[in-house]
Interface confidence: low
């Protein structure tokens, strides 16, 4: 059976298409091509006489068509108006005519799309943004990409207008993009340049660094404040509620105890109109802000009950500190047998009893800091009881 095939079926505007013929009968006088689904003389494109190998253009000939001896028809520089059906009529030598109809579709070579936006400087958690992919073209699929990924499933993302419009509901700072739209048809695809959103947000609660609270007199105090914000926050500093300066960094050289107090960083975003503050307490003191971990030692860790005594010593290199002792989470001394000496650095137990067995540790502290030693275990043994009546125990 006579058939035709379009190569390709989907044609890019300006390209060419070949209407191939299959199963062409052997004995032919000629054949004609027509535009449409039926034979219509007014819409004949070309006729071909096999005997003379002569091609004759018809009323629907545009000058872009070429017919070949095998009946195939080449149409060059196609336009969208060429889309549709084409009918081949074969005039056989037995005067029985055969017909076959084929079709193809011409699509435009898509231009590079662009993204228009109703708001390129939205405010976080407040504004919605609608992106529209331009231009609007027929038979076109619209796709969107965020950060080079296809759209995630999100209730904040809505597609409309045949996917040509992407709406972001209640934008966040993470919605900066980039955003790209892609237009596709069966013959071409083109992606827009990326568009980024300048999401106005913040300021978030500022962070004051460094995190240190304690400083020694004579040191330099350098505090830096940062709050996530777009546009970047404007900063100001207050000390004990009194305005100092409008900078991101506060520097006070050679501090004294009088510089102790409440340091407030104020961050302001003039676009969002929002302000945030963070307060940091600074203490200027001679005392060591970090007391080193003390070491605990025992004269012996295994003793005989009611017989031995033991000395526990708490060692530290820090000055201006106090020492306290703990046994099983209880503060010591807890009995008359326990004595503290040498500024509480030594705990003496004399004599040791069964109930003194367990974990001991010491703690060194000053008004602003403290630290504990590792625990030490005291084991208390008793000599075996003498056997009574010559009987074996048990």
């Amino acid at each position: 059976q006579l058939t035709t095939e379009s190569m390709p079926f989907n044609v890019a505007e300006g390209k060419e298409v070949l209407l191939l013929v299959h199963n062409l009968p052997q004995q032919l006088f000629g054949y004609s091509w027509y535009k449409g689904e039926r034979v219509d003389g007014n819409r004949q494109i070309v006729g071909y006489a096999i005997g003379t190998q002569q091609a004759t253009p018809g009323p629907a000939n545009s000058g872009r068509e070429t017919i070949y001896p095998n009946a195939s028809l080449l149409i060059q520089n196609v336009t969208q108006n060429d889309t549709g059906f084409y009918t081949l009529q074969v005039i056989k030598s037995d005067l029985v005519n055969e017909e076959a109809t084929g079709q193809f579709h011409v699509y435009p070579e898509l231009p590079k799309p662009s993204i228009s936006s109703n708001n390129s400087n939205p405010v976080e958690d407040k504004d919605a943004v609608a992106f529209t992919c331009e231009p609007e073209t027929q038979d076109t699929t619209y796709l969107w990409w965020i950060n080079n990924q296809s759209l995630p499933v999100s209730p904040r993302l809505q597609l409309s207008n045949g996917n040509r419009t992407l709406t972001l509901l209640s934008v966040t700072r993470n919605d900066t993009g980039p955003y790209e739209c892609e237009i596709q048809n069966p013959v071409s695809a083109n992606r827009s340049d990326p568009v980024t959103l300048n999401v106005t947000y913040g300021p978030d609660t500022p962070t004051i660094s460094p995190s240190d609270t304690y400083y020694r007199p004579g040191a330099n105090l350098s505090l830096s404040c940062y709050a996530a914000s777009n546009p970047p926050a404007q900063y100001s500093w207050l000390i004990n509620g009194t305005f100092q300066q409008s900078t991101q960094e506060l520097f006070i050289p050679n501090i004294t105890v009088n510089n102790s107090g409440s340091y407030t960083c104020h961050a302001n975003n003039s676009v969002t109109g929002c302000n945030r503050t963070t307060v940091k307490t600074i203490i200027v003191t001679e005392l060591s802000p970090v007391v080193a971990k003390p070491q605990i030692k025992a004269s012996k860790t295994t003793v005989t009950g009611d017989k031995d005594s033991v000395n526990l010593t708490c060692s530290t290199n820090d000055t201006g500190i106090s020492i306290r002792w703990f046994f099983k989470n209880q503060s010591l001394p807890s009995s008359e047998r326990m004595k503290l000496s040498q500024g509480n650095t030594t705990l003496s137990i004399n004599p040791v009893k069964r109930e003194d067995a367990g974990t001991y540790w010491c703690e060194v502290f000053n008004p602003i800091s403290k630290n504990q030693s590792d625990p030490i275990m005291l084991n208390v043994n008793y000599n075996a009881l003498p056997q009574e009546n010559g009987l074996s125990p048990g």
């Epitope: 830096s224 546009p231 960094e249």
Partner: antibody
Framework: EVQLLESGGGLVQPGGSLRLSCAAS????????MSWVRQAPGKGLEWVSV????????YYADSVKGRLTISRDNSKNTLYLQMNSLRAEDTAVYYC??????????????WGQGTLVTVSS | QSVLTQPPSASGTPGQRVTISCSGS????????VSWYQQLPGTAPKLLIY???KRPSGVPDRFSGSKSGTSASLAISGLRSEDEADYYC???????????FGGGTKLTVLG
């Protein structure tokens, strides 16, 4: 199209003076902080000075403080650098550059083609 | 001696990925945005990256910036011969109250 065009460079003797200009076009000049950046022959970039969009805030590199003065005339869309007490180490190509962030996140998105200042006796 | 430290040179072959580092301190990179500039021979510098990692329009996505702590880096993927240039990092310095640049890295595209 944003354009920055420096002029006023040339040969000057040590101790002498020179005034550089930078004519801006293609953008609203008064909305942008502007800087001068220099580059000695065969060397890297060295920031010289910045002036805020309204001219109220000015900063200088330590190496030029007291000798170089930055200014701007927003009505003429022009940035200036008055250079006094010039030294041999001031020899460089001087670029004017635009900061689109008003100094909040300083960066230079457009640069002029530069003008050469040579300090030599 | 530059406030920001960059390697003086870097190299790679076409198609390779190269990274240029920029080291500073808490007064500049640690608390401020970093920018990267490309300077082709005989031309003015051109902005490649601003605000640590943002690309101006027109800059290929082969160029990317990142920052961690007091160090920043510029990565160039799919290296091309036209990438041969000097690359500078820059940031505002809170201590100096001024903008500081790295000493620059000369990138050579081999082969």
């Amino acid at each position: 199209e944003v354009q920055l065009l420096e002029s006023g460079g040339g040969l000057v003797q040590p101790g002498g003076s020179l005034r550089l200009s930078c004519a801006a076009s293609g953008f609203t000049f008064s909305n942008y902080a502007m800087s001068w950046v220099r580059q000695a022959p065969g060397k890297g970039l060295e920031w010289v000075s910045v002036i805020s969009h309204g001219g109220g805030s000015i900063y200088y590199a330590d190496s030029v403080k007291g000798r170089l003065t930055i200014s701007r005339d927003n009505s003429k869309n022009t940035l200036y650098l008055q250079m006094n007490s010039l030294r041999a180490e001031d020899t460089a190509v001087y670029y004017c550059a635009r900061d689109p962030t008003k100094g909040y996140a300083p960066t230079f998105d457009y640069w002029g083609q530069g003008t050469l200042v040579t300090v030599s006796s | 001696q530059s406030v920001l430290t960059q390697p003086p040179s870097a190299s790679g072959t076409p198609g390779q990925r190269v990274t240029i580092s920029c080291s500073g301190s808490s007064s500049n990179i640690g608390n401020n945005y970093v920018s990267w500039y490309q300077q082709l021979p005989g031309t003015a510098p051109k902005l490649l990256i601003y605000a640590d990692s943002k690309r101006p329009s027109g800059v290929p996505d082969r160029f990317s910036g990142s920052k961690s702590g007091t160090s920043a880096s510029l990565a160039i993927s799919g290296l091309r011969s036209e990438d041969e240039a000097d690359y500078y990092c820059g940031a505002w310095d809170l201590s100096l109250n001024g903008y500081v640049f790295g000493g620059g890295t000369k990138l050579t595209v081999l082969g």
